[in-house]
Structures are given as structure tokens and as C-alpha cells.
């Protein structure tokens, strides 16, 4: 994948629906100038072309949604990085500016006379991409144009400014909501004192200086906060670890509001460094309960805990997509590339044969081995279900009466659909109701997940409480298995009696040492000490002065 | 600062047990290491045992060496020395609670596996 | 893992030598070198590769990145007399030896 020749997935239809998914992975640091992409992708590319295909089907076989009108699609690959993304932004854009000159499917030559070419339909919205930064760039491109478009996994909180993203909505929560969730993790647990890693970019940003922002409110200190890129090397991995180390044993529970990605480098690095079991990861949705990111490096992701956007498998999605195979899938240009990398073999005689790999395809293959759907396939096909209502309900308003596209609703007017997009109601895939807010976001519902060894060299992850609404469930015993076990990461223990917290110039409000009153002094506050007045005496507790009663001495006294 | 003892001569194939005694300093805040060196020879690091219990070894020495620790000493066992363990073992803090910089070393304790 | 040259060097009184310390893959800096004088613990002189350990005076000067470090000793004096180290302060894992062979400096 190179930026000289780009694949697109086509399906045709009445309404053209663009779509960026991250097909493949993104280009690693020294390929990023000439935008070649990385090796295919199956939760967040395959599966999401697959849902998209699979979902306008359904849609289109729906009588009760759009009738007589059939949605298709242009699907490109953004490959999870904002040149990509953007490029192929600029071919939807082009699409549309070219069809905007036409005159019933005419293109006017330059000469006035006209041409029977017909050019492509114009794009009337996006769904995706996956990744905030990378989503944040396309929207200020779509915008322009007035296409809106409809985000399945971008949560940065900057996304719900309208005033600078207008044409954004998304069928997730904003970023501020699992900021406040790992708030509250923390707090939970009586973690006074954490390190913070972020990936670079908006969404590892933003959500980090919420949580940062929420935890000096709360009273929890941040021992140090580093930022690295998703796609950084070796190195750059290992000085953060060894950074971290530094922070040890007070900060032992590392906040990541991270890419996958990242915490997978984190991991990596880990086991270079000999770090397993040193920390506790406290992950974002990046992470969730993505095994791509802990396979191989099960040891250090232990113990992890991560929050995960609700959204239940689909199975529909599973019966449609575990049937499908290279012989007959051809509408997914990049199907047969994906196949080949799956199952490490070649296929023979096929138009993409990857000569790389040394072992043939057998028939006998299936993707049905060691399935996983993507974590955000609800959300994925949400999004393509609330283009659709939107549409629907916009037809239903421009063309009363009317079965298909009306010519009021010709050429359609992303200003309207926008409009249209944003009263939107429908009950999801899921059950659960998908609406809009005033800033296009969706309600925030969280389950807690915790990585944990099930079994000798079974690893797996556990729902272990959810956060919804602002209210968090933990099941603790089964985080933790007794009380005993729950990790400390605090910088300094409470003082004893009698004792105050001297805090050391520079030093977080977390970080003190303890330093014991003076013989006539009292604790009046945990940060000073004061003197008892004359004729009084600190009493047992050290908290406040006592009246030395009055002995009078007489003659025959001992001495004192 | 950390001393150790236990250095004395054994016969090969005999265990034997090093300690490490700390002062001044938690077991719980930073990590503990062995190092050693033969008789007119270079530097050779052994293992450590973590501020957190974790313990890592130089290939070499996994399955010859265990280290251990309580609140206040670090034990070094040899399982079945053999004469080219004959050397000083040094104990050394290290500068963090895990891997990093040595940067307190003890005397050192001479060991000497004769038959 | 570490591997450490020139193995012995004679150096006049107020010269100047240079020990090289190679690694076998990138330790970012992560290195330290440590002075050792017959019967006595080895001392810290450098950290970080180039981060001048407290007490040690300023003739002492590391550099380096990635797989090469070097320490450089100027205005020899007689007390400079002794066997230097490197180590590599990146990784418990998968490690042969963290120290370098050594170098004995003798000042004439």
C-alpha cells in the first residue's frame, strides 16, 4: 500500500455512503513520507469492510427503511494516519465536486458540448475513521463541503466543539466520560500517587488532561506524565519504561490513556526490560480487551485493568461473516491480501498470490479459527444504521407520500441531512437507543475489564464492573481475590500522632515526610505544629492543649 | 550501606549461602544486586532481586543461583559450586527499586570452592 | 553483551585516555562506568552515560548514544591509576554480562 495506487471497495447504490477504515496498519516512522502503509488488518480493517457491505445489504432488503431507494458505498483505507486519511478524503470531496457540475448525469465539456460520460455519484456522508486525530483532520476537509460525517470510535473530547467541527457526530461518548471513569478507578483503590503515559494525538491528548485535570481535583497526584507515538521504536519505548521505573515502588499503577498500539510498545518493552509484574496498567479504550495488543506479552499485561465501551457481539455479523472465503469473496479488494496474512500461506492462481509466503492455501481453511469480532462492531454498524435513519427521515420530510428519491431531495444537502442526522432515534443493534446530543455525542456506557491469568499460560479478560452514567460497579474480589492484594501506589504514608506533613519544595502535595511536633507543641493542622500557651500542656492526642492544673507546694515537699 | 557475609571455603557440589545485611535503606524501595569477581579477573554481574520480590539472572547463572530477601538482608545461594566460582561476591544496591545503576557496594566476601 | 577496549593502556601523567564500550544492540544511553582500585569495591563515576556521579572531578567525561559510549580521562594523575568498567544499566534480561571486559589504566 503506497500512496502511488489506492484500492477502493465499491457497491453501488441510489445514495453513495463514503466510508475510512483502517484497512491497514499505519506506516511506520521511516515509511510515513511516502505513506506506505503497514501489514492488513482484521478487527479494524476486514471486519469493518465486511460490516459495512453486510449492513447496507440489510438495509437494503429493509422495506420499512428507505424503500425504493438503495444505499451504496465507496470504502477507502485511512490506514490509521492523517496523510492517508486525508488523501483519500480528498477523492470522496472530488467525487462530489465533480458531481455538482453535472447536468442529469452529464459532464459539460470544456468546449459547452456535453459528454456521455457519467461520473461517479457524490459521497453524502462518512462514516468513520476509527482514530480521533486522524477523524479530527478529515472533519475539517468534510466540513467545507457540508458532508457530515458519523464516527464509530473517535471519543476525543474536542469533537463535541460544533463550532468547530459541525458536521461531526458520533455514536460513542466523548473522552471526558472514561476520563472520569479511570477517576474513579483510581480513587476506588486509594491510588493517591500514579504515573500517566498518553499516545501522542488528540484522542491520548485530550483524555489525558481530563484525567489529569479530574485527578488534581480529587486529590491524586501525578508522579510524572509522558507522551510517545503509537508508531515510536524500541528506544523510544524503552526510556519511558525506564522513566517509570524511576517513579518506583510509590507510583506503581501507570494510567495510559492510549492507543492499543501503544500499550502493546509498553509491553514490548516490558519484557526487554524486565519489568513484568512491576506495574498496573490502567488502560483507556485503546486498549479495552483487545488481544492483538497483549498476544505474546500475556506476563506483563497482567493484572491490567481497562475500560471498554459497551457493545455486545453482533452475531448476525458472525453468521455473515465466518462463511466468507477467497474463492467467492470479490467485492473486498483487499480480501484475498487479508487471507494470505490470516493463514501465512499463498494462494495459488489467485490475482493477488503473495509469493512471500512458502506454504499454499488449503481449502480446508476457515475463518472460524481463533475468531474474534472487533470490539466496536456495534458501533460500526451503528453509525451505518443512523446515515441510513437519517436519511429516511429526511425523505420522509423532503418527499411525503413518495417512494424514493424525490427531486426535492436531488442533489441531496448535507446542511439538511446534518439536520436530519441530528434528531435521529432508533434503537441499535444492541437494544439500546442511539441519539444524538446538541454536540452530536452519544450517552457514555462503560464495562471494566482486568486481564488476568485464568489458568497456567491462559490468559483472558474478565468483566469486572462497569461505569455508566457517572456511577461505578466493581466486583473487587474478583480484581483482587482478597483485600491484602490490592496494590499501593501513594508516595507517603500517613503520618502518626503527633506528627506533621512537611512537604519538600517541588514536591507533589502527595509527597511529604513526617516530622513529629515538639515537646509543648500540638498537631493544629496535618501541616503545622503550634505551641501550647503558657500554663497549658498538649494533651494525649496531641490535638489540642490541656490547662496544667495548679499544685501548690508546701513546706515538707520533695523536691520536684 | 550493605555488608556481606557468608564468604568461606566449601568443597564443590557443597551449597552454599550468602547474606547481604542492609542499613540505612528499605529493601522495599530499591533493588539488590550480586556481582563478582575471580581472583585477577573482570566484573561479573549475577542477578538481582527487585524492590517488588521480581528476580532476574545473568544467563549464565539461572538454575545455579537464587536470590532471595527479608525485610533486612538479601541471601545469595550457590546450589552446587564449582571451582570457577571461586571469586569476591560483592552486594550491591542498586539506584531505583529495579534495574538501573550500582551505586552502593559492599566489601565484598570471599568464596573459595576447593576440593 | 558488552564489549570493552582497549583491554590495558600506559598513559604519562597529566595525558589523556579514551576506553570505548560497545554494545550489542541500542542501550539508549542507559550506561554507567565504574573505577575500581585493587582491594576495594569498584566506585560509580558516570551515569546516563555522560552524568558525572557526586565527588567525581570533572577530568572524568562520558559520551556516547545508542551502541557506542566512550569514557575520556584528562589530566591524568597518579590516583587515576585503575581498571574501568562500563555497564549497561538498560536490562536484567537476557543478559550475559552487564559489565565490560575492563580496562586497566596504568599512569606512568
Known amino acids: 500500500q503506497s500512496s502511488e495506487r489506492r484500492v477502493v471497495a465499491h457497491m453501488p447504490g441510489d445514495i453513495i455512503i463514503g466510508a475510512l477504515f483502517s484497512v491497514h496498519h499505519q506506516p511506520t516512522v521511516d515509511k510515513v513520507h511516502e505513506r506506505k502503509c503497514g501489514a492488513v488488518r482484521e478487527q479494524y480493517g476486514i471486519q469493518r469492510v465486511e460490516a459495512m457491505l453486510h449492513t447496507l445489504e440489510r438495509i437494503n432488503s429493509d422495506p420499512t427503511l428507505l424503500p425504493n431507494i438503495t444505499l451504496g458505498c465507496e470504502i477507502r483505507d485511512s490506514c490509521w494516519h492523517s496523510a492517508v486519511a486525508l488523501e483519500q478524503s480528498i477523492e470522496f470531496i472530488r467525487d462530489s465536486l465533480i458531481s455538482s457540475e453535472e447536468e442529469e448525469g452529464l459532464v459539460r465539456c470544456v468546449d459547452g458540448s456535453s459528454s456521455s460520460f457519467r461520473s461517479k455519484k457524490p459521497i453524502v456522508g462518512v462514516i468513520g475513521p476509527g482514530s480521533s486525530s486522524v477523524a479530527i483532520q478529515v472533519q475539517n476537509l468534510l466540513q467545507l463541503f457540508n458532508i457530515p460525517q458519523i464516527a464509530y470510535s473517535a471519543t476525543s473530547m474536542d469533537l463535541s466543539d460544533k463550532t468547530l467541527f459541525k458536521y461531526f457526530m458520533r455514536v460513542v461518548p466523548s473522552d471526558a466520560q472514561q476520563a472520569r471513569a479511570m477517576v474513579d478507578i483510581v480513587k476506588r483503590y486509594n491510588w493517591t500517587y500514579v504515573s500517566a503515559v498518553h499516545t501522542e494525538g488528540n484522542y491520548g491528548e485530550s483524555g489525558m488532561e481530563a484525567f489529569k485535570d479530574m485527578s488534581a481535583k480529587e486529590g491524586i497526584c501525578i508522579a510524572h506524565s509522558y507522551k510517545i507515538y503509537s508508531n515510536a521504536g524500541e528506544q523510544s519505548f524503552d526510556k519511558l519504561l525506564k522513566k517509570l521505573t524511576s517513579h518506583l515502588p510509590k507510583a506503581r499503577v501507570v494510567a495510559c490513556f492510549c492507543e492499543g498500539m501503544t500499550v502493546r510498545g509498553l509491553l514490548m518493552a516490558m519484557r526487554r526490560l524486565g519489568l513484568a509484574g512491576e506495574f498496573l496498567l490502567l488502560g483507556s479504550d485503546g486498549w479495552a480487551d483487545r488481544y492483538d495488543v497483549t498476544d505474546g506479552y500475556q506476563r506483563e499485561a497482567v493484572g491490567g485493568i481497562t475500560i471498554k465501551l459497551q457493545s455486545p457481539d453482533v452475531k448476525w455479523f458472525d453468521d455473515y461473516y465466518l462463511k466468507l472465503r477467497p474463492e467467492t469473496n470479490h467485492r473486498n479488494p483487499w480480501f484475498q491480501e487479508f487471507w494470505q496474512h490470516r493463514f501465512q500461506c499463498r494462494l495459488e492462481g489467485f490475482p493477488q498470490e503473495n509469493s512471500k509466503y512458502n506454504k499454499t492455501c488449503n481449502s480446508s481453511l476457515t475463518l472460524k479459527t481463533h475468531h474474534v469480532q472487533d470490539s466496536k462492531m456495534g458501533f460500526v454498524i451503528n453509525a451505518i444504521y443512523s446515515m441510513a435513519y437519517g436519511l429516511h427521515n429526511m425523505q420522509m420530510s423532503l418527499c411525503p407520500g413518495y417512494a424514493g428519491l424525490c427531486d426535492a431531495m436531488k442533489p441531496i444537502d448535507g446542511r439538511k441531512l446534518l439536520e436530519s442526522l441530528m434528531k435521529t432515534n432508533f434503537t441499535g443493534v444492541s437494544g439500546d437507543t442511539i441519539l444524538f446530543d446538541e454536540n452530536g455525542d452519544s450517552p457514555g456506557r462503560y464495562e471494566i475489564m482486568n486481564f488476568k491469568e485464568m489458568g497456567k499460560d491462559y490468559f483472558d479478560y474478565i468483566n469486572v464492573g462497569s461505569w455508566d452514567n457517572g456511577e461505578l460497579k466493581m466486583d473487587d474480589d474478583e480484581v483482587w481475590s482478597k483485600k491484602s492484594n490490592i496494590i499501593r501506589s501513594v508516595c507517603s504514608e500517613p503520618c502518626e500522632k503527633g506528627q506533621i506533613k512537611v512537604i519538600r519544595k517541588g514536591e507533589v502535595s502527595c509527597c511529604w515526610t513526617c516530622t513529629p511536633c515538639k515537646e509543648n507543641e500540638y498537631v493544629f493542622d496535618e501541616y503545622t505544629c503550634k505551641a501550647c500557651q503558657l500554663g497549658s500542656w498538649p494533651t494525649d492526642d496531641l490535638t489540642g492543649c490541656d490547662l496544667i492544673p495548679v499544685q501548690y507546694l508546701r513546706w515538707g515537699d520533695p523536691e520536684p | 550501606s550493605v555488608e556481606e557475609s557468608g564468604g568461606r571455603l566449601v568443597t564443590p557440589g557443597t551449597p552454599l549461602t550468602l547474606t547481604c545485611t542492609v542499613s540505612g535503606f528499605s529493601l522495599s524501595d530499591y533493588g539488590l544486586n550480586w556481582v563478582r569477581q575471580a581472583p585477577g579477573k573482570g566484573l561479573e554481574w549475577i542477578g538481582i532481586i527487585y524492590a517488588s520480590g521480581s528476580t532476574y539472572y545473568a544467563n549464565w547463572a539461572k538454575g545455579r543461583f537464587t536470590i532471595s530477601k527479608t525485610s533486612t538482608t538479601v541471601d545469595l545461594k550457590m546450589t552446587s559450586p564449582t571451582t570457577e566460582d571461586t571469586a569476591t561476591y560483592f552486594c550491591?544496591?542498586?539506584?531505583?527499586?529495579?534495574?538501573?545503576?550500582?551505586?552502593?557496594w559492599g566489601p565484598g566476601t570471599l568464596v573459595t570452592v576447593s576440593s | 553483551d558488552m564489549t570493552q577496549t582497549p583491554a590495558s593502556v600506559e598513559v604519562a601523567v597529566g595525558g589523556t585516555v579514551t576506553i570505548k564500550c560497545q554494545a550489542s544492540?541500542?542501550?539508549?544511553?542507559?550506561l554507567a562506568w565504574y573505577q575500581q582500585k585493587p582491594g576495594q569495591p569498584p566506585r560509580l563515576l558516570i551515569y546516563g552515560a555522560s552524568n558525572l556521579a557526586s565527588g567525581v572531578p570533572s577530568r572524568f567525561k562520558g559520551s556516547g548514544s545508542g551502541t557506542e559510549y566512550t569514557l575520556t580521562i584528562s589530566d591524568l594523575e597518579c590516583a587515576d591509576a585503575a581498571t574501568y568498567y562500563c555497564?549497561?544499566?538498560?536490562?536484567?534480561?537476557?543478559?550475559?554480562?552487564?559489565f565490560g571486559g575492563g580496562t586497566e589504566v596504568v599512569v606512568k
Open positions: 550491591v544496591r542498586d539506584s531505583s527499586a529495579t534495574y538501573d545503576y550500582f551505586n552502593l
Open positions: 544492540q541500542s542501550i539508549s544511553s542507559y
Open positions: 555497564q549497561q544499566a538498560l536490562s536484567p534480561s537476557n543478559v550475559d554480562n552487564a
